[in-house]
């Protein structure tokens, strides 16, 4: 679809005569008839296959034709066509004299023709005007013409329809050839697909407008390239959505069970060595001079009772010093000047001579120690109890009293809070750092799933005669506890009046 435009510029008829040579009276009131048709090697009369147009009277004899397009006038003349422009044409322009106001062909005498020109040739679609001038014996016509496409039609022959749009069926303008030129941020054959934020993951992200990155379920992050782990995942990661792959040192469904307390909490103080001894449990091996579960207590060097044979210990800046009792000497009062004759063994210890009586050794009864059996055995000095267990001397032996959650001879084993199956009615038990949590099945609630939330079988008061009703939680039924004098599943029968049965 397009328009053949013809711009008449100047017509010269100096003598004011018709084609026959006869002069016009009083002058030639000139109007034009234009016929546009398909290409003919020799332009001949016949149908104006591409269209016709006529002008009003434009002037008398010789005149210039005003460009009237801006005022909505008829110059240039418009010959619209609704087909593919073939690139060739034939054009006939006739100048006629109008004696009166009726310009219809049948109203004019045949000899009212002033001049007739016919041209043919090639014409490409374009904005540029082709200027031409045709001269006959008595007249001269100067004009220009061109073919342009109608609005929204493009291409070499005005055959491509293209309408710019900016909605969800396309975001584009039209190029001169009729191809689409996508607006910034849009792509696709019809420019209907937004260009997502640069780097937005192809599979896991999408967008509904340019420079956006919306994540599909299970993905997150600016570029939708981070998976979302399982809900509740504490110390874990994922490679695909809803996973919970535990970080090193963590375990459990939600990676919330600490398998490496030492690394995560560094509980041991003063340079002690930490050893993991189970889930959420550890043991600290103290450096010399420190004690306590976490080696948090500083020991006096005298606390280890280094002085033997009743020697008294004095702390010094660079260590300690033993003050020995009479009859003993040495760094730790370990050498005796006594012999068995001096009865040096206490608490029923028996004395044995050594080195021909120059020395002696005491053999101590149970529960006593020391070179003179002067010390009661304290089996707790080595802090044998792990995980904060309390050491107790029990005569010849010792025992560890463990903190809640630990067991074993030395409290070295972590007791799973779930081991004793604390969740009632088939509840699922989860170990937590400070206790446990029960996930209850439908119909139960409470910290241990001990509360039945289903319909109370006693709610309908099924028991008669002031009997007490009990709900059997396992079967959702009731049991009636009858008062004295009544029997029956609902305590409905008085004793001595047996029910009447149909048999």
């Amino acid at each position: 679809s397009g328009v053949f435009q013809l711009q008449l510029q100047e017509f010269i008829n100096e003598r004011g005569v018709l084609a026959s040579g006869r002069p016009c009276e009083p002058g030639c009131r000139t109007f034009f008839r234009v016929c546009l048709k398909h290409f003919q090697a020799v332009v001949s009369p016949g149908p104006c296959t591409f269209g016709t147009v006529s002008t009003p009277v434009l002037g008398t004899n010789s005149f210039a034709v005003r460009d009237d397009s801006s005022g909505g006038g008829r110059n240039p003349l418009q010959l619209p066509f609704n087909f593919t422009w073939p690139g060739t044409f034939s054009l006939i322009i006739e100048a006629w004299h109008a004696p009166g106001d009726d310009l219809r062909p049948e109203a004019l005498p045949p000899d009212a023709l002033i001049s007739k020109i016919a041209i043919q040739g090639s014409l490409a679609v374009g904005q540029n005007w082709l200027l031409d001038e045709q001269t006959s014996t008595l007249t001269r016509l100067r004009y220009s013409y061109r073919v342009i496409c109608s609005d929204n039609y493009y291409g070499d022959n005005c055959s491509r329809l293209c309408k710019k749009r900016n909605d969800h069926f396309g975001h584009y303008v039209c190029q001169p050839d009729g191809n689409l030129s996508c607006l910034p941020g849009w792509t696709g054959e019809y420019c209907q697909q937004p260009i997502c934020l640069s780097g937005c993951h192809e599979q896991n992200g999408y967008c509904s407008k340019p420079a956006e990155c919306l994540c599909r379920p299970g993905w997150q992050g600016r570029l939708c390239n981070e998976c979302i782990p399982h809900n509740g995942c504490r110390h874990g990661t994922c490679s695909t959505p809803w996973q919970c792959t535990c970080d090193e040192g963590w375990g459990g469904l939600f990676c919330d069970q600490d398998l490496n307390y030492c690394t995560h909490h560094s509980p041991c103080k003063n340079g002690a060595t930490c050893s993991n001894s189970g889930q959420r449990s550890y043991t600290c091996t103290c450096r010399p001079g420190y004690t306590g579960v976490d080696c948090e207590l500083e020991l006096s060097e005298c606390d280890s009772n280094p002085c033997r044979n009743g020697g008294s210990c004095k702390d010094q800046e660079d260590g300690y010093h033993c003050l020995c009792p009479p009859g003993y000497y040495g760094l730790h009062c370990e050498h005796s000047t006594l012999s068995c004759a001096d009865s040096p063994c206490f608490n029923g210890g028996s004395c044995r001579e050594r080195n021909q009586g120059a020395n002696y050794a005491c053999e101590c009864p149970p529960n006593f120690t020391g070179s003179n059996c002067e010390k009661k055995v304290d089996r707790c000095t080595s802090n044998p109890c792990a995980n904060g267990g309390q050491c107790l001397n029990r005569g010849p032996s010792r025992m560890c009293r463990c903190r809640p959650g630990f067991t074993g001879t030395y409290c070295e084993l972590h007791v799973s809070d779930c081991a004793r199956n604390p969740c009632a009615h088939g509840g699922t038990c989860h170990d937590l750092e400070n206790g446990l949590m029960c996930t209850c099945p439908a119909g139960f609630s409470g910290r241990r799933c001990e509360v039945r939330t289903s319909i109370d079988a006693c709610a309908s008061s099924p028991c008669f005669n002031r009997a007490t009703c009990y709900t059997d939680l396992s079967t959702d039924t009731f049991v009636c506890n009858c008062p004295y004098g009544f029997v029956g599943s609902r305590c409905e029968f008085p004793v001595g009046l047996p029910p009447s049965f149909p048999w």
């Epitope: 609005d151 329809l161 309408k163 710019k164 749009r165 909605d167 069926f169 696709g188 209907q192 919306l214």
Partner: antibody, heavy 121, light 106 residues
């Protein structure tokens, strides 16, 4: 051959929410060439475009119904749905689902057979 | 809001040409579609992109669109063409239908 089939209750009470589902067979709802629309026609009256949705979930609604209408898509089931809240008797109509083709410049080449929804107490 | 105006009815004798107009502001700058709807049936697309026919639509249906008016022309109208006809265009992101024209074949 692509087919569209509307389903949902034929009677809705005033002030309640109208819910319809359109099931697409014979073609994928995730094809980037198509949008999926809802159109309605009150008895004896003309067609009214309600809104449409793209497989990504982008929605477009008629401003005259905005605030009351929600269209969603479930690509796994090859379905899209319409919800119209706070209905009145004026929402009584035959509701059609249709396929809008980008290549046809938004023309709807396939329609469901339509389902009559009456709003009445 | 954008409106498309159609004549309520058009009557035509069999074999004659029926023309249905659809008017809207600068409609020629939008793509017009036309739908045929027979009683009790779903609409059928007969023209898209102003003047193109989907496969299966007879050649007697043609369309044009320029200025403020789109036109559906049924040449050599047949009794089976008796139906309601709706024009449709997109205004930004909103679909707009004309009010519909009832074509009666006398």
């Amino acid at each position: 051959e692509v087919q569209l089939q509307e389903s949902g209750p034929g009677l809705v009470k005033p002030s309640e929410t109208l819910s319809l589902t359109c099931t697409v067979s014979g073609g994928s709802i995730s094809n980037s060439r198509y949008h999926w629309g809802w159109i309605r026609q009150p008895p004896g009256k003309g067609l009214e475009w309600i809104g449409d949705i793209y497989y990504t979930g982008s929605t477009y609604y008629n401003p005259s119904l905005k605030g009351r209408v929600t269209i969603s898509v479930d690509t796994s089931k090859n379905q899209f749905s319409l919800k119209l809240s706070s209905v009145t008797a004026a929402d009584t109509a035959v509701y059609y689902c249709a396929r809008e083709d980008v290549i046809l410049r938004g023309g709807s080449d396939y329609w469901g057979q339509g389902t009559l929804v009456t709003v009445s107490s | 809001s954008y409106e498309l105006t159609q004549p309520p009815s058009v009557s035509v004798s069999p074999g004659q040409t029926a023309s249905i107009t659809c008017s809207g502001q600068r409609l020629g700058d939008k793509y017009a579609s036309w739908y045929q709807q027979k009683p009790g049936q779903s609409p059928v697309l007969v023209i898209y992109e102003d003047s193109k026919r989907p496969s299966g639509i007879p050649e007697r249906f043609s369309g044009s669109n320029s200025g403020d008016t789109a036109t559906l022309t049924i040449s050599g109208t047949q009794p089976m063409d008796e139906a309601d006809y709706y024009c449709q265009a997109w205004d930004r992101d909103t679909g707009v239908f004309g009010y519909g024209t009832k074509v009666t074949v006398l």
